[in-house]
Interface confidence: medium
């Protein structure tokens, strides 16, 4: 851990992070903000990761300083340089890996003082489900599909008309390993669908929760999906 910045006479400044999750294979953001300084050259940002010897990222005197960067983060990190002056120290992490999960420290030095905050970063895979009428199956069947999840999620069906009903007996869920042998495709089928109803397919693991809704009436079928990351706590 690199801390050696005990400059006497400086106060502590407020640094805020938000626990977040990264979608493996995609780009992620480790969020961190601080009390801004008027001079960019006086701001130092250090990102550290518990258990990693080198730095994740360092920004000082208005530019990246990557001589101490750990090999596992080489070429994968960037701060939003134009937003540092307004107190944004967030880190962009490219091509998130499963091994990027862990505790990160956002360490800030400005002319006003120094401060730090930890951030729990989870990694996994999550994707929006799409619910469709399964026209290849018997006629009262819905199919919920989501291309990438990890760890293996739970899948639960619900309906607006039959609130509280347990659909486990009339649904079937399968998990198919994707080609990179980590993430899995989720497919869940719901049988005995009735008309004039809205059905929801809810997929959840410890990182994210996603819902695909389908509204079925005799004259139209409407779909929508949404996804929320879990455990987004500020510290």
């Amino acid at each position: 851990l690199i801390i050696g910045f005990g400059i006497s006479g400086r106060h502590s400044i407020t640094v805020t992070t938000v626990a977040s999750a990264g979608n493996i294979g995609e780009d992620g953001i480790l969020s961190c903000t601080f009390e801004p300084d008027i001079k960019l050259s006086d701001i130092v940002i250090q990102w550290l990761k518990e258990g990693v010897l080198g730095l994740v990222h360092e920004f000082k005197e208005g530019k990246d300083e990557l001589s101490e960067q750990d090999e596992m983060f080489r070429g994968r990190t960037a701060v939003f340089a134009d937003q540092v002056i307004v107190g944004n120290a967030s880190l962009r992490l490219k091509n998130v890996q499963l091994t990027d999960a862990g505790t990160y420290k956002c360490y800030i030095i400005t002319s006003k003082g120094k401060g730090n905050a930890n951030l729990e970063y989870k990694t996994g895979a999550f994707s929006m489900p799409e619910v469709n009428v399964d026209y290849n199956a018997s006629s009262e069947t819905l199919r919920c599909e989501a291309p990438r999840w990890f760890p293996q999620p739970t899948v639960v069906w619900a309906s607006q008309v039959d609130q509280g009903a347990n659909f486990s007996e009339v649904s079937n869920t399968s998990f198919e390993l994707n080609s990179e042998n980590v993430t899995m495709k989720v497919v869940s089928v719901l049988y005995n669908v009735t008309i004039n109803n809205t059905y929801s397919c809810m997929i959840e693991n410890d990182i994210a929760k996603a819902t695909g809704d389908i509204k079925v009436t005799e004259s139209e079928i409407k779909r929508r999906s949404h996804l929320q990351l879990l455990n987004s706590k500020a510290s």
Partner: antibody, heavy 117, light 112 residues
Framework: QVQLVQSGAEVKKPGASVKVSCKAS????????MNWVKQAPGQGLEWMGW????????TYADDFKGRVTMTRDTSISTAYMELSRLRSDDTAVYFC??????????WGAGTTVTVSS | DVVMTQSPLSLPVTLGQPASISCRSS???????????LHWYLQRPGQSPRLLIY???NRFSGVPDRFSGSGSGTDFTLKISRVEAEDVGVYFC?????????FGGGTKVEIK
């Protein structure tokens, strides 16, 4: 409003091919299957098959297998039906019809195909 | 394939009077999921077909309540309680229980 707009009438020679288009509007194209139905002059309706607009996978009725090809272009919400090796008994009106669960709830106006030497 | 047989072929009716069309299938239309996928369509002169009744007896949205469907297994009936001028056209029964989906030959309803 929901509608299916089909391409115009065609006159073809025996042995030729015809490709009929069906442009959907007013609803999310990939949420419904698209079917094709043949109606020969003064005759009833004959189901030719359908395409899953979501996956692009077609299913053909046995009587048309080998001569019919159903495709779709989701970017322009359009389904296509191509019939090859045309014969005189292919002279008919061809309808596209949206499948909602168990039935055809929206139909195109039909495309007349005349096969004549 | 399931053969759908309609009768009569032609049905001359008087305005305001009831009308009935029969449809028989060559095999049961009860699906393994216990539903019966028998539907009725009307094709007015020069137009494309439109859905009237789905799953034996369910009136499609916008269809007047003078139209009703009934039946089970292999025997089905479409009834019009009081025929109106706009009801003229060819009525088709259709099944979607078995692939390929098939239609009846049609019943032409005309005003006497």
């Amino acid at each position: 409003q929901v509608q299916l707009v089909q391409s115009g009438a065609e006159v073809k020679k025996p042995g030729a091919s015809v490709k009929v288009s069906c442009k959907a509007s007013g609803y999310p194209f990939t949420t419904y299957g698209m079917n094709w139905v043949k109606q020969a002059p003064g005759q009833g309706l004959e189901w030719m098959g359908w395409i899953d607009t979501y996956s692009g996978v077609p299913t053909y009725a046995d009587d048309f297998k080998g001569r019919v090809t159903m495709t779709r272009d989701t970017s322009i919400s359009t389904a296509y039906m191509e019939l090859s090796r045309l014969r005189s008994d292919d002279t008919a009106v061809y309808f596209c019809a949206r499948r909602s669960f168990w039935y055809f709830d929206v139909w195109g106006a039909g495309t007349t195909v005349t096969v004549s030497s | 394939d399931v053969v759908m047989t309609q009768s009569p072929l032609s049905l001359p009716v008087t305005l305001g009077q009831p009308a009935s069309i029969s449809c028989r299938s060559s095999q049961s239309l009860v699906h393994s999921n216990a539903n019966t996928y028998l539907h009725w369509y009307l094709q007015r002169p020069g137009q494309s077909p439109r859905l009237l009744i789905y799953k034996v007896s369910n009136r499609f949205s916008g269809v007047p309540d003078r139209f009703s469907g009934s039946g089970s297994g292999t025997d089905f009936t479409l009834k019009i309680s009081r025929v109106e001028a706009e009801d003229v056209g060819v009525y088709f029964c259709s099944q979607s229980t078995h692939v390929p989906w098939t239609f009846g030959g049609g019943t032409k309803v005309e005003i006497k």
